[in-house]
């Protein structure tokens, strides 16, 4: 056959289902490849063919829409599975064509079994709530365009095993949960099930979230060095190893860059002849707040090094802050021990 | 579609057990709940406890705990419920009825369990 | 466990006629109500599910409607093949429970 733009096998588009629900999958050629929509493509003559190979497999082979019910059937550029089976799993490939054009992508399709609470190998989108912040809401994801809007699902939330009733502070509302006030005990997986008939027949939808309560904007401040700090001094002597901790808190701010960096007389460590190592360790708290360690090392320490200027810098999208190390050179202790031990007669 | 198929009636002495099969066809086995209800002769419906197939949980209602066991053999796509200690009251019209979520959206037709000496 | 009273335990009607059920918990069970329907000797058939969705297949002058601890099925014309037993079952917490039942006959 003539030569096809074959885009490769699109990894970045795991798409995962569960076992026995419904699941649209549409063809990624006009999502991610294409400068075209299947509209136009339809109307330029261009006809997309599917064909999938199953898991373990190397032959390609076409899918079989003639199955009882119309398990699996095409429309536009989707393809419908109602209901997905377990050796649905494989690589799917959508083609578009004409005599004189060919383009295609596969896409792997994982189809995955859920235990009685609702885990599974689905990978789970993480959606975060501010704490204390007044009234949020989680909707139930990646549920349109499976029924019309005539048709009333019903929905039941579930939060880990068990259905979301009489909870303080969350309120299923449809397909949305409302939290009133989330707090740290609010942290979890939440499932959404959504019902609904079709052609005599009863589907299910399941959606996975997982909730994380992070800090609010209300409370977030510019970041804080609590080292280095005024009341501790560096005092070393020529041939020690200096270490000088620079410990900086950032309050959760979302989709911000935290950052810290030393400058050794106002320059970046990488640009001075020094023989600096920075090691760096970050760790979390509950609400994603965060603090960032950067340990500054200079292994045999020079009388010039410790005349220097050591600084801390840090940024959020708060703002920046600098903090100078304070460094010092130790001076010689008078060696009493001589004439203290003459002094007590000592011979 | 969706079929569940149950073994046929059972005369029982008391005292004696009593499994009754509930053969699942149509849609996958081990991702819906299945429940067992009973009905003796001229009275409502009784939930005994269900049981999750793919993993095996199961929650009994305190009434049959102890007495009742509800297994799942996943390869065969059939339920089992085993009552034990059979009484005369215990003389009823036994259900399988499978649900995705908690609601019993298909039934399988009956076995009548008959305990009498 | 949560009892489920219903109301009439039986009731007599003419083809064409509006027919109501009741059920009352003993607790609110936050909409989690279901219906079936039995007939003579057969299993019982899933109605409406989260007290007003109806499943799928059922005719649609069944209708659910309630909050709370009152719930309502509403056969809108009653039909000759709707004599049956209805029964109302709550699925808020375990153990699930079962009113128990109503008989629909026609006049």
């Known amino acids: 056959s003539e030569r096809c733009d074959d885009w490769g096998l699109d990894t970045m588009r795991q798409i995962q289902v569960f076992e026995d629900e419904p699941a649209r999958i549409k063809c990624p050629l006009f999502e991610h490849f294409l400068k075209f929509n299947y509209s136009t493509a339809h109307s330029a003559g261009l006809t997309l063919i599917w064909y999938w190979t199953r898991q373990d497999r190397d032959l390609e082979e076409p899918i079989n829409f003639r199955l009882p019910e119309n398990r699996i059937s095409k429309e536009k550029d989707v393809l419908w599975f109602r209901p997905t089976l377990l050796n649905d799993t494989g690589n799917y490939t959508c083609m578009l064509r004409n005599t004189t054009y060919c383009s295609k992508v596969a896409f792997p399709l994982e189809v995955v079994q859920k235990d009685s609470c609702f885990n599974s190998p689905m990978k789970l989108p993480v959606h975060k709530l501010y704490i204390e912040y007044g009234i949020q809401r989680i909707t139930c994801p990646n549920v349109d365009g499976y029924f019309p809007s005539s048709v009333k699902p019903t929905i039941t939330w579930y939060m880990g095993c068990y259905k979301i009733q009489n909870f303080n502070n969350v309120i299923p509302e449809g397909m949305n949960l409302s939290f009133l006030i989330a707090l740290i005990s609010n942290n979890g997986n939440y499932t959404c099930v959504v019902t609904y008939p079709e052609n005599g027949r009863t589907f299910h939808l399941t959606r996975t979230l997982t909730v994380k309560v992070v800090g609010s904007p209300k409370n977030a401040v510019p970041p804080v060095i609590h080292s280095p700090n005024d009341h501790v001094v560096y005092e070393k002597e020529p041939g020690e190893e200096l270490l000088i901790p620079c410990t900086v808190y950032f309050s959760f701010l979302m989709d911000s860059r935290n950052e810290v960096w030393w400058t050794i007389d106002g320059k970046k460590p990488d640009d001075i002849t020094i023989d600096v190592t920075i090691n760096e360790s970050i760790s979390h708290s509950r609400t994603e707040d965060e603090t960032r360690t950067q340990i500054l090392s200079i292994k045999k320490v020079t009388s010039e090094d410790l005349k220097r200027s050591y600084v801390c810098h840090a940024r959020s999208a708060k703002g920046e802050v600098a903090k100078a190390a304070k460094v010092k050179q130790k001076v010689p202790a008078p060696r009493y021990t001589v004439e203290l031990a003459c002094g007590f007669g000592a011979t | 579609q969706v079929q569940l198929v149950q073994s046929g009636a059972e005369v029982k002495k008391p005292g004696s057990s009593v499994k009754v099969s509930c053969k699942a066809s149509?849609?996958?086995?081990?991702?819906?709940?299945m429940n067992w209800v009973r009905q003796a002769p001229g009275q409502g419906l009784e939930w005994m406890g269900r049981?999750?197939?793919?993993?095996?949980?199961?929650h009994y209602a305190q009434k049959f705990q102890g007495r009742v066991t509800l297994t799942a053999d996943k390869s065969t796509s059939t339920a089992y419920m085993e009552l034990s200690s059979l009484r005369s009251e215990d003389t009823a019209v036994y259900y399988c009825?499978?649900?995705?979520?908690?609601?019993?959206?298909?039934w399988g037709q009956g076995t009548l369990v008959t305990v009498s000496s | 466990d949560i009892q489920m009273t219903q109301s009439p335990s039986s009731l007599s009607a003419s083809v064409g006629d509006r027919v109501t059920i009741t059920c009352q918990a003993s607790?609110?069970?936050?909409?989690?109500l279901n219906w079936y329907q039995q007939k003579p000797g057969k299993a019982p058939k899933l109605l409406i599910h989260y007290t007003s969705g109806l499943h799928a297949g059922v005719p649609s002058r069944f209708s659910g409607s309630g909050s709370g601890t009152d719930f309502t099925l509403t056969i809108s014309s009653l039909e000759p093949e709707d004599v049956a037993t209805y029964y109302c079952?709550?699925?808020?917490?375990?153990?699930?429970?079962f009113g128990g039942g109503t008989k629909v006959e026609i006049k």
């Open positions: 607790q609110g069970i936050n909409n989690y």
């Open positions: 149509g849609y996958a086995f081990t991702s819906s709940w």
């Open positions: 079952q709550q699925y808020s917490i375990l153990p699930w429970t």
């Open positions: 049981i999750y197939p793919g993993d095996g949980n199961t």
């Open positions: 009825g499978e649900g995705y979520l908690d609601p019993m959206d298909y």
